[in-house]
């Protein structure tokens, strides 16, 4: 299916005469009849096998024909056909004079014919127009023509039907030759098959739309390459769908039998050691002082009379404790205590008897401490130095070495770096932990505001009307050099228009 299109461009009949040579009155009101038919070596009258079309009156005598495809499709003229284009044709174009308004063949006198042209040849389907001009003794006709396929028809003969679609039956557009061109993400003869997510497992995965990867029963994951264990599986995995391969410590068909009760349930109490002894069975080895299947019962450790030398036993949460009689000490009161006769005091400490000689006390000299004066006093242990000062032991005393900026016995005083007014030109001083900082007034910079910097008074563009601005470095002010026609400190007033003051 296609359309033969004929575009009439210009008709010349300068003398305004009919084919018979008789002039038209008042002029030749010209319309055209077109006949399209199969190829004939010699074009002869007969049926217009491919179609006919007539125009209204297009002009008088000589005229150019407007392209009127938008206004009703009269030019180019359309000769549709619904068969395979054969590639050859015959074309007859007749120009007629219309004395009245009735253009029907039977309403016209036979001598109303102005001119008749007949051509034949081969014509391929395509978008390009073929331009032609036919001249007779008295007339000239310029025109162009082409054959194009109807919507949804393609190929050299407009015989290939292709209608683009994007639905369940296909996802494609049509190429110029009528072949299907699949939309992105679709494949197959009719572009009905989605292209799944790249890497989607060929057997285990499928898709219903492009870039998707849906898994067949028993498979999971982004690419459907990992299996799903059996529905009843409890502590297992799989290498193929619905398997149940037990994790370590589990057994049974569905991996629900506990072979490692110790790890999974920690049944033994009070620090006992657990040993697996079969499915869901275990043995607890208790720590001293505990008994029971799970070592949950505490033995009274005083039952074995562990305290010696008359010591009394007291049960405690984590064992027992011996209260020793005077003169004995140790876990089980197994050691007898020292007396001053044993010279127990070190570093010149003096011994004093207590409780009728049952025990003693040491009086320690300075710099020593402990029940036997065995420890040297470290006066720095209490960290007495503030603000990061370093503590130094100096014989019987101590001293603090302070960080810069601090003073005092314990470095507790902050030395003010601002006390000596270090900031020049009226700069404001700020004490910091590690020194000081100066905030400089306008026109000065540097760590101590010692550098003079000029203020660019022109930076704010204070001058109007394209005046030139100059900075007075001595006073840090600006001067405006006014262009002709302007006055004022900022060149803001036009000459001849004095400022209007409100009084």
């Amino acid at each position: 299916s296609g359309v033969f299109q004929l575009q009439l461009q210009e008709f010349i009949n300068e003398r305004g005469v009919l084919a018979s040579g008789r002039p038209c009155e008042p002029g030749c009101r010209t319309f055209f009849r077109v006949c399209l038919k199969h190829f004939q070596a010699v074009v002869s009258p007969g049926p217009c096998t491919f179609g006919t079309v007539s125009t209204p009156v297009l002009g008088t005598n000589s005229f150019a024909v407007r392209d009127d495809s938008s206004g009703g499709g009269r030019n180019p003229l359309q000769l549709p056909f619904n068969f395979t284009w054969p590639g050859t044709f015959s074309l007859i174009i007749e120009a007629w004079h219309a004395p009245g308004d009735d253009l029907r063949p039977e309403a016209l006198p036979p001598d109303a014919l102005i001119s008749k042209i007949a051509i034949q040849g081969s014509l391929a389907v395509g978008q390009n127009w073929l331009l032609d001009e036919q001249t007779s003794t008295l007339t000239r006709l310029r025109y162009s023509y082409r054959v194009i396929c109807s919507d949804n028809y393609y190929g050299d003969n407009c015989s290939r039907l292709c209608k683009k679609r994007n639905d369940h039956f296909g996802h494609y557009v049509c190429q110029p030759d009528g072949n299907l061109s699949c939309l992105p993400g679709w494949t197959g003869e009719y572009c009905q098959q989605p292209i799944c997510l790249s890497g989607c497992h060929e057997q285990n995965g499928y898709c219903s739309k492009p870039a998707e990867c849906l898994c067949r029963p028993g498979w999971q994951g982004r690419l459907c390459n990992e299996c799903i264990p059996h529905n009843g599986c409890r502590h297992g995995t799989c290498s193929t769908p619905w398997q149940c391969t037990c994790d370590e410590g589990w057994g049974g068909l569905f991996c629900d039998q506990d072979l490692n009760y110790c790890t999974h349930h920690s049944p033994c109490k009070n620090g006992a050691t657990c040993s697996n002894s079969g499915q869901r069975s275990y043995t607890c080895t208790c720590r001293p002082g505990y008994t029971g299947v799970d070592c949950e019962l505490e033995l009274s450790e005083c039952d074995s009379n562990p305290c010696r030398n008359g010591g009394s036993c007291k049960d405690q949460e984590d064992g027992y404790h011996c209260l020793c009689p005077p003169g004995y000490y140790g876990l089980h009161c197994e050691h007898s205590t020292l007396s001053c006769a044993d010279s127990p005091c070190f570093n010149g400490g003096s011994c004093r008897e207590r409780n009728q000689g049952a025990n003693y006390a040491c009086e320690c000299p300075p710099n020593f401490t402990g029940s036997n004066c065995e420890k040297k006093v470290d006066r720095c242990t209490s960290n007495p130095c503030a603000n990061g000062g370093q503590c130094l032991n100096r014989g019987p005393s101590r001293m603090c070495r302070c960080r810069p900026g601090f003073t005092g016995t314990y470095c507790e005083l902050h030395v003010s770096d601002c006390a000596r007014n270090p900031c020049a030109h009226g700069g404001t001083c700020h004490d910091l932990e590690n020194g000081l900082m100066c905030t400089c007034p306008a026109g000065f910079s540097g760590r101590r505001c010692e550098v003079r910097t000029s203020i660019d008074a022109c930076a704010s563009s204070p001058c109007f009307n394209r005046a030139t601005c100059y900075t007075d470095l001595s006073t840090d002010t600006f001067v405006c050099n006014c262009p002709y026609g302007f006055v004022g400190s900022r060149c803001e007033f036009p000459v001849g228009l004095p400022p209007s003051f409100p009084w």
Epitope: S208, L214, C215, R216, P217, G218, W219, Q220, G221, R222, E226, I228, P229, N231, G232, C233, R234, H235, G236, T237, D247
Partner: antibody, heavy 118, light 107 residues
Framework: EVQLVESGGGLVQPGGSLRLSCAAS????????MAWVRQAPGKGLEWVAT????????YYRDSVKGRFTISRDNAKNSLYLQMNSLRAEDTAVYYC???????????WGQGTLVTVSS | DIQMTQSPSSLSASVGDRVTITCRAS??????LAWYQQKPGKAPKLLIY???NLADGVPSRFSGSGSGTDFTLTISSLQPEDFATYYC?????????FGQGTKLEIK
């Protein structure tokens, strides 16, 4: 014994958010895909979302896509459903279930009620 | 999406009766069908998977059959604890879909 216990349901206004949790025990949680299935009052069952055990791939029913997010924390044996932009039609009992979209739902929690109403 | 249609939507029966519930899929789902039992206020419970496999701990009076698009759940001799709502579910195609349910009541 396999146990799935949901929590986090409640009354929320349309457009609001809610986060459901599901605590799993009695099986090796990290080995199994999990899902959320809901049941509107007096209605049938409706699959909502699924997450794989292997790589955390997620799937959602069309009506919740872009609003709900399923996630899991294998270290905590927990499954979650973050629900945003809630609508009245999301009102349902939400069940945590063990299974994928292409396998039966072998074990179910007791459910948690989500009511979306102004 | 595949539509699952259960029939009947409700039925009354007596203890000891043989009961059959059917489930029809809108397209072929092979044998990828499960049946669930749900009692009021409780969670569903898996009864049968892969059309005819009994889930762990489910009594043998429950059985399943069918393939393709037509499936059946049969309870050979009703017990008092069997009165509940039964759902079928297909897991052959994404997304998974359930039937609307069949309520089994005491006559």
């Amino acid at each position: 014994e396999v146990q799935l216990v949901e929590s986090g349901g409640g009354l929320v206004q349309p457009g609001g958010s809610l986060r459901l949790s599901c605590a799993a025990s009695g099986f090796t949680f990290s080995n199994f895909p999990m899902a959320w299935v809901r049941q509107a009052p007096g209605k049938g069952l409706e699959w909502v979302a699924t997450i794989s055990s292997s790589d955390g791939t997620t799937y959602y029913r069309d009506s919740v896509k872009g609003r709900f997010t399923i996630s899991r924390d294998n270290a905590k044996n927990s499954l979650y459903l973050q629900m945003n932009s809630l609508r009245a039609e999301d009102t349902a009992v939400y069940y945590c279930a063990r299974g994928y979209y292409n396998s039966p739902f072998a074990y179910w929690g007791q459910g948690t009620l989500v009511t979306v109403s102004s | 999406d595949i539509q699952m249609t259960q029939s009947p939507s409700s039925l009354s029966a007596s203890v000891g009766d043989r009961v059959t519930i059917t489930c029809r899929a809108s397209e072929d789902i092979y044998s990828n069908l499960a049946w669930y039992q749900q009692k009021p206020g409780k969670a569903p419970k898996l009864l049968i998977y892969d059309t005819n496999n009994l889930a762990d701990g489910v009594p043998s009076r429950f059985s399943g059959s069918g393939s393709g698009t037509d499936f059946t759940l049969t309870i050979s001799s009703l017990q008092p604890e069997d009165f509940a709502t039964y759902y079928c579910q297909q897991y052959n195609n994404y997304p998974p879909t359930f039937g609307q349910g069949t309520k089994l009541e005491i006559k």
